[in-house]
């Protein structure tokens, strides 16, 4: 008789999750030779230990501490790019501008990007059928707690000028409920971070509005200023040209506003 299994509202663990995490870890050490001695089996064991045999609505940041310790990585603190609701462009940017880093350019972010996982209380099984949805089921689920933990640590590590890419096509360009708005903004350290510079990415080709004047951007500016961090904002009117100019800054067309 099959054992009764909790049905959650979200999709189940990504298929071949253990193999995917291990393979990504090995690939990361190949791409980033400064991490060439990382023991990926130890990393996987710590990852697994954070959620296996635990109730998937009862996960804490403490559960992920062993993994956080193993994944400790020195990223240049003045080269951090945060993003909200515009992941693909942020990643395209750091692929070109190799000295800048998003969270997903770090080992732990790279391991978990776009994956889902959860276990079951009192069994060593991974649940491939369903996992808790943040809204419909619970917020303290393995995936949400992981991203909250790594995002907090990433923001805490930042210094000097921190950049954030925001999606100007959304109704809330800055969303207080996003990971950026709820975690990263509040964990930037005022004694280390001088300025948060927002890059608002325009979607429409003919969109010439100054989205830095958007009420949600003004709200972000207010939050940041209250934290004794300076705020600046730039419109990126042409993201395609923006990327092209990052690739070829000498191009004559790159002196005008992008």
């Amino acid at each position: 008789v099959p054992r009764w299994r909790q049905q959650w509202s979200g999709p189940g663990t990504t298929k071949r999750f253990p193999e995917t995490v291990l393979a990504r870890c090995v690939k990361y050490t190949e791409i980033h030779p400064e991490m060439r001695h990382v023991d990926c089996q130890s990393v996987w064991d710590a990852f697994k230990g954070a959620f296996i045999s635990k109730h998937p609505c009862n996960i804490t940041e403490e559960d992920y501490q062993p993994l956080m310790k193993l994944g400790t990585q020195t990223v240049p603190c003045n080269k951090i790019l945060l993003w909200s609701r515009i992941k693909d462009l942020a990643h395209q940017f750091t692929q070109v501008q190799r000295d800048m880093f998003t969270l997903e350019d770090t080992l732990l972010g790279y391991l978990a990007d776009d994956l889902t996982w959860c276990g079951e209380f009192n069994t060593s099984k991974i649940n491939y059928q369903s996992c808790p949805d943040w809204r419909k089921d619970c917020s303290n689920n393995p995936v949400s707690v992981f991203w909250k933990t790594v995002s907090r640590r990433f923001a805490e590590a930042a210094c000097d000028v921190v950049h954030v890419m925001l999606n100007g096509s959304r109704s809330k360009i800055f969303d207080k409920n996003s990971t950026f708005g709820s975690v990263e903004v509040h964990n930037l350290q005022p004694e280390k971070v001088q300025t948060l510079e927002a890059w608002v990415i325009h979607g429409g080709r003919e969109d010439s509005r100054d989205l830095c004047q958007d009420p949600t951007i003004k709200e972000l500016e207010s939050i940041i200023s209250k934290r004794n961090i300076q705020f600046s904002c730039k419109n990126i009117y042409r993201p395609d040209k923006f990327l092209q100019c990052v690739k070829n800054p000498e191009d004559s067309s790159c002196t005008s506003e992008i």
Epitope: V38, L70, T74
Partner: antibody, heavy 120, light 110 residues
């Protein structure tokens, strides 16, 4: 045959400078991360620092940071250790050692030179 | 004071099995692969074990390495007089961003 051969050791006054060389042969030097490791008389191994294949990345032990500089000339298959502001405690045998890469895996310090002695 | 802790000495009689321990922390041994080096008297160190438990070609299978959590160990079975040497463990430290060695263990074959 894979070989590393250090040279440039000798006697130097405290506060003085010295440049050690490590000539590599028998392998693709351009791709190899290269280490300097030292051993004071009667003591254990102490890692000094490392440089990546194209010379753009270096890491140093705290004890030598700001005083020692690791560089390389890939056209000459040679690794260097420029030592300045030398102290008595820098007296040691200095070894160069290769980090190898095989099948996308790295192997730390799989080949060592015979060492060169520095006396301060 | 080394970041990795090894016993300063170990001994055994020919044919015996001896184990040398190496203890560290979560940012070095636990996170990264452990390597072991053998230094015979008056010679340069030689790689003995890489990636926790792998042996380079030419190293006898009497030498074996293992790792568990923040500790690693080197086992030598069927001890021979030519095994008399100093043994060092080593690994990268992700927080210090440096390579760290243990203080070394002098193995005496009685």
């Amino acid at each position: 045959e894979v070989q590393l051969l250090e040279s440039g050791g000798g006697f130097v006054q405290p506060g003085g400078s010295l440049r050690l060389s490590c000539a590599a042969s028998g392998f693709n030097f351009n791709n190899a991360w290269m280490n300097w490791v030292r051993q004071a008389p009667g003591k254990g191994l102490e890692w000094v620092g490392i440089i990546n294949g194209d010379g753009t990345n270096t890491y140093y032990a705290d004890s030598v940071k700001g005083r020692f500089t690791i560089s390389r000339d890939n056209s000459k298959n040679t690794l260097y250790l420029q030592m300045s502001s030398l102290r008595a405690e820098d007296t040691a045998i200095y070894y160069c050692a290769r980090d190898n890469k095989l099948n996308d895996y790295y192997y730390a310090m799989d080949v060592w030179g015979q060492g060169t002695t520095v006396t301060v | 004071q080394s970041v990795l802790t090894q016993p300063s000495s170990a001994s055994g009689t020919p044919g015996q099995r001896v184990t040398i321990s190496c203890s560290g922390g979560s940012s070095n041994i636990h996170a990264n692969y452990v390597y072991w080096y053998q230094q015979l008297p008056g010679t340069a160190p030689k790689l003995l074990i890489y990636r926790n438990s792998q042996r380079p070609s030419g190293v006898p299978d009497r030498f074996s390495g293992s790792k568990s959590g923040t500790s690693a160990s080197l086992a030598i079975s069927g001890l021979q007089s030519e095994d008399e040497a100093d043994y060092y463990c080593g690994t990268w430290d992700n927080i210090l961003n440096v390579w760290v060695f243990g203080g070394g263990t002098k193995l005496t074959v009685l």
